[in-house]
Interface confidence: low
């Protein structure tokens, strides 16, 4: 801030501040501490006042220096506390579902376990791990889908798949294949050996 | 379908008046927070004005503040832009937009307004 | 007021070109950053919003990227209808600015 003659008596400049001229006119240029004519007032915005990321202005009312808020975009008031769009303000989230800015106008929610949707209205299907056998559940649309590893199928993944109902078989040279749970094994002839009868038998 | 319909510009003299409007349709006016954007020829689109849903928070660039004021009627799902004391730096084409995620997400085909004695 | 640069005002492609038009913030944007298509006959349209997330109805050979200062808009197979003027605009602060436009013409 800047004021005339500072290097009268009575005039100079307060706390620290220095009393420069130019142009013919001789004004105080005060650190960043003070504010005014003299530097005789303390900094407002020291104190930082503006939230959420307002900038604060230092402005002249009547003489003392007081202080103004630019608020960043989605706040308003004095000091920026009013929220304008913000989309969790709301409460979107339901069943305890925690709500995330990711725009201010746009949100996710976090839910809790059991609960799903875009604002955790929904009972999360897969909650009860209904996929058996290391199958990966999928919530689709009220219900779930259960992704199967290869040697099950079925809704849930119970189902073991027969590999030995594939054509051609899987046990070569004339072995016999003998379905297990999650597998299958091959009973080779005495002339081949291997785990699908590959190999001859030396 | 979203539509955004701007009208009231035209010739004006310096330091005069005008009163642009936005017809919104399409969708529910009340629901969306609305900004002004103008082009002077050849230039960089300006961003002019906002307003929030019901009209209670307004924000102006410095450009046009104490002089332009932007107002809604949600009743009649229409925008206002109250121009006064129009400089010829204001010469531009005036775009109405609906803002959502943030960002102006449709846009009215503009109406010039030409500042010139 | 934040300064958004678009250092190229123009770029001549062609079709089936990858194209990538840049801007940059005077500060940091937190990737508050969206980017607008204008056609030769001033109609405007959305394309980019937040930075990556692309508009309903945008082809999905527009992509964006970028953080902190740096942005940019990516048409991964020039189409003779992406003849426009690309701006970038940001949202971090009031007032929201504009980049000066880069203006994509057909070799």
């Known amino acids: 801030a800047r004021g005339p003659r500072c290097s009268q008596p009575g005039e100079t400049c307060l706390n620290g501040g220095k009393c420069e001229a130019a142009n013919g006119t001789e004004a105080c240029v005060c650190g960043g501490a003070f504010v005014g004519p003299r530097c005789q007032d303390p900094n407002p915005c020291l104190s930082t006042p503006c939230k959420n990321a307002g900038t604060c202005h230092v402005v002249d009312r009547r003489g003392v220096a007081d202080y103004a808020c630019s608020c960043a975009l989605g706040f308003s008031g004095p000091l920026c506390l009013t929220p304008l769009d913000n989309a969790c303000l709301t409460n979107p989230c339901r069943n305890g579902g925690t709500c995330d800015l990711l725009t201010l106008t746009e949100y996710k929610c976090r839910c809790p376990p059991g609960w799903s949707g875009k604002s955790c209205q929904q009972a999360d299907p897969c909650a009860s791990n209904p996929c058996a056998n290391g199958g990966q559940c999928l919530p689709f649309e009220a219900s779930y889908i259960c992704h199967c590893p290869p040697s099950f199928h079925g809704p849930t993944c119970r189902q073991d798949v027969n590999e030995c109902g594939q054509k051609p078989g899987l046990c070569r040279h004339g072995g016999t294949c003998h379905n297990e749970v999650g597998s299958y094994r091959c009973v080779c002839r005495a002339t081949h050996t291997g785990p699908n009868c590959e190999r001859p038998y030396v | 379908e979203v539509q955004l319909v701007e009208s009231g510009g035209g010739l004006v003299q310096p330091g005069g008046s005008l009163r642009l409007s936005c017809a919104a349709s399409g969708f529910t006016f009340s629901s969306y927070t609305m900004s002004w954007v103008r082009q002077a020829p050849g230039k960089r689109l300006e961003w002019v004005a906002y307003i929030d849903y019901g009209g209670d928070f307004t924000s102006y660039s410095d450009a046009i503040r104490g002089r332009f004021t932007i107002s809604r009627d949600n009743a009649k799902n229409t925008l206002y832009l109250q121009m006064n004391s129009l400089r010829a730096e204001d010469t531009a084409i005036y775009y109405c937009?609906?803002?959502?995620?943030?960002?102006?997400?449709?846009w009215g085909q503009g109406t010039l307004v030409t500042v010139s004695s | 007021d934040i300064q958004m640069t678009q250092s190229t005002s123009s770029l001549s492609a062609s079709l089936g070109d990858r194209v990538t038009v840049s801007c940059s913030a005077s500060?940091?944007?937190?990737?508050?950053l969206n980017w607008y298509q204008q056609k030769p006959d001033g109609t405007l349209k959305l394309l980019i919003y937040?930075?990556?997330n692309l508009h309903s109805g945008v082809p999905s050979r527009f992509s964006g990227s970028g953080s902190g200062t740096d942005y940019s808009l990516t048409i991964s197979n020039l189409e003779p209808e992406d003849i426009a003027t690309y701006y970038c605009q940001q949202y971090s602060k009031f007032p929201w600015t504009f980049g000066g436009g880069t203006k994509l013409e057909i070799k």
């Open positions: 937040y930075t990556t």
């Open positions: 500060q940091a944007i937190s990737n508050y």
């Open positions: 937009s609906r803002r959502r995620y943030d960002a102006m997400d449709y």
